[in-house]
């Protein structure tokens, strides 16, 4: 996201819209306490960041409250009253959404539905990944609305499952960021496992009736 | 397909005023920020004005700022650039463009804009 | 305001050659340089976003590279559609602009 200006990197990740977090990484001022100097508005004055992040003891980054805002955020970084890098974005390209909530799985014979809680907002990507101990690698499907069904796995084998949120790179562009995974989850003939085996099992011999 | 078209060009008089439209489709209109960017006949590229998704932040070249008013109708997929007190420097090709911060992949055919007595 | 500045501001080539085109800044813009094609008539295309991403669909004989101040576009091997006019746009911090544009026509 950030060549360099003056040697500073930055990085904006706008998480589930709601808040801004800028972060930058300045080997020129390493151990300088930059500060942050930013506004939603070209014409209102800059205002100091008020919740700072802090490494080994100085200033790396800032999170701003901004809940839904889709305008630009002006912004300046600054050692004392000298300014290293400023520049304007849209905020809302680099969106990350919040991780997945209430993640439910319906099954049915070879096939389960997974469902969690949409997003308040739009243009987003559901990803259910899966694999199972046989599988080398996760299978992925994905979705407009959290509402993914997979089919064609194999009642006898364990499966693992995560989910996350993407947002749509024809929407937002590149710039965005998926969200966290959910927790791995982990099923066996419709039913919860802690665990998948790691090594797979030999499938249980077929009982004659 | 991503789609945008512009229209409301046409000759008029320094002093006076025009709208121009750009007509969306083939994406979420209200998701994205749009632009006004403009080409004088034979010259560069300038970039007039901006719209962020919801209407509710406009940005403008300092050029054109007082008289021009970019503005957007999100339920019908429309883009607007209200162009007063217009001057002959005004005189040129107007384009809506779709972009982010990372350039702009998204652009109308333009519509020519002439300012003469 | 950022001002843009493109060199050279037309020059002639040959279908095959190599053909680079300078941008530069007047002042440090990071990597928020963008790169278009504009043939006559019609609306710009977008090249190559973030100094040195190629976008979708444009073909791998374009590329981008710099940070900083200067910047550079290549067409490693010139084609007869790639006879147009190339601008550089600053997307560092709004107001948003453009170099003046490099004209690349048929020697």
């Known amino acids: 996201q950030g060549g360099a200006a003056e040697g500073v990197q930055i990085q904006i990740i706008y998480f589930n819209l709601e808040t801004v977090q800028v972060t930058w990484n300045a080997s020129k001022y390493s151990r300088t306490n930059l500060t942050f100097h930013y506004r939603f508005n070209g014409d209102e004055a800059y205002d100091q960041c008020t919740n700072y992040l802090l490494q080994e003891g100085h200033t790396s980054g800032c999170l701003l409250d901004a809940e839904q805002r889709d305008d630009i955020l002006y912004f300046s970084i600054r050692n004392g009253t000298h300014p290293v890098f400023t520049a304007s974005r849209w905020m809302v390209y680099y969106l990350k959404p919040s991780s997945p909530k209430h993640v439910r799985f319906s099954w049915h014979q070879d096939a389960v539905t997974v469902t969690c809680s949409d997003l308040s907002y739009g243009d987003l990507l559901y990803e259910v990944q899966y694999r199972s101990p046989f599988d080398t690698e996760w299978q992925s499907k994905q979705e407009n609305t959290c509402n993914v069904t997979i089919e064609g796995l194999d009642a006898e084998k364990c499966y693992s499952f995560w989910v996350r949120v993407k947002a749509m790179e024809d929407v937002y562009g590149p710039d965005t960021y998926p969200s966290d995974w959910s927790e791995v989850t982990c099923w066996q003939r419709g039913e919860i496992r802690d665990a998948c085996a790691e090594t797979p099992t030999p499938p249980k011999p077929k009982l004659s009736k | 397909e991503v789609q945008l078209l512009e229209s409301g060009g046409g000759l008029e008089q320094p002093g006076g005023s025009l709208r121009l439209s750009c007509a969306a489709s083939?994406?979420?209109?209200?998701?994205?920020?749009m632009n006004w960017v403009r080409q004088a006949p034979g010259k560069g590229l300038e970039w007039v004005s901006a719209?962020?998704?919801?209407?509710?932040?406009?940005y403008y070249a300092d050029s054109v700022k007082g008289r021009f008013t970019i503005s957007r109708d999100n339920s019908k997929n429309t883009l607007c650039l209200q162009m007063n007190s217009l001057r002959a420097e005004d005189t040129a090709v107007y384009y809506c463009?779709?972009?982010?911060?990372?350039?702009?992949?998204?652009w109308g055919q333009g519509t020519l804009v002439t300012v003469s007595s | 305001d950022i001002q843009m500045t493109q060199s050279p501001s037309s020059l002639s080539a040959s279908v095959g050659d190599r053909v680079t085109i300078t941008c530069r800044a007047s002042?440090?813009?990071?990597?928020?340089l963008n790169w278009y094609q504009q043939k006559p008539g019609k609306a710009p295309k977008l090249l190559i976003y973030a100094a040195s991403s190629l976008q979708s669909g444009v073909p791998s004989r374009c590329s981008g590279s710099g940070s900083g101040t200067d910047f550079t576009l290549t067409i490693s091997s010139l084609q007869p559609e790639d006879f147009a006019t190339y601008y550089c746009?600053?997307?560092?911090?709004?107001?948003?602009?453009f170099g003046g544009g490099t004209k690349v026509d048929i020697k």
């Open positions: 083939g994406f979420t209109f209200s998701s994205h920020a």
């Open positions: 719209i962020s998704g919801s209407g509710g932040s406009t």
């Open positions: 746009q600053q997307s560092y911090s709004t107001p948003l602009t």
């Open positions: 002042q440090s813009i990071s990597i928020y």
């Open positions: 463009a779709r972009g982010h911060n990372s350039g702009w992949p998204y």
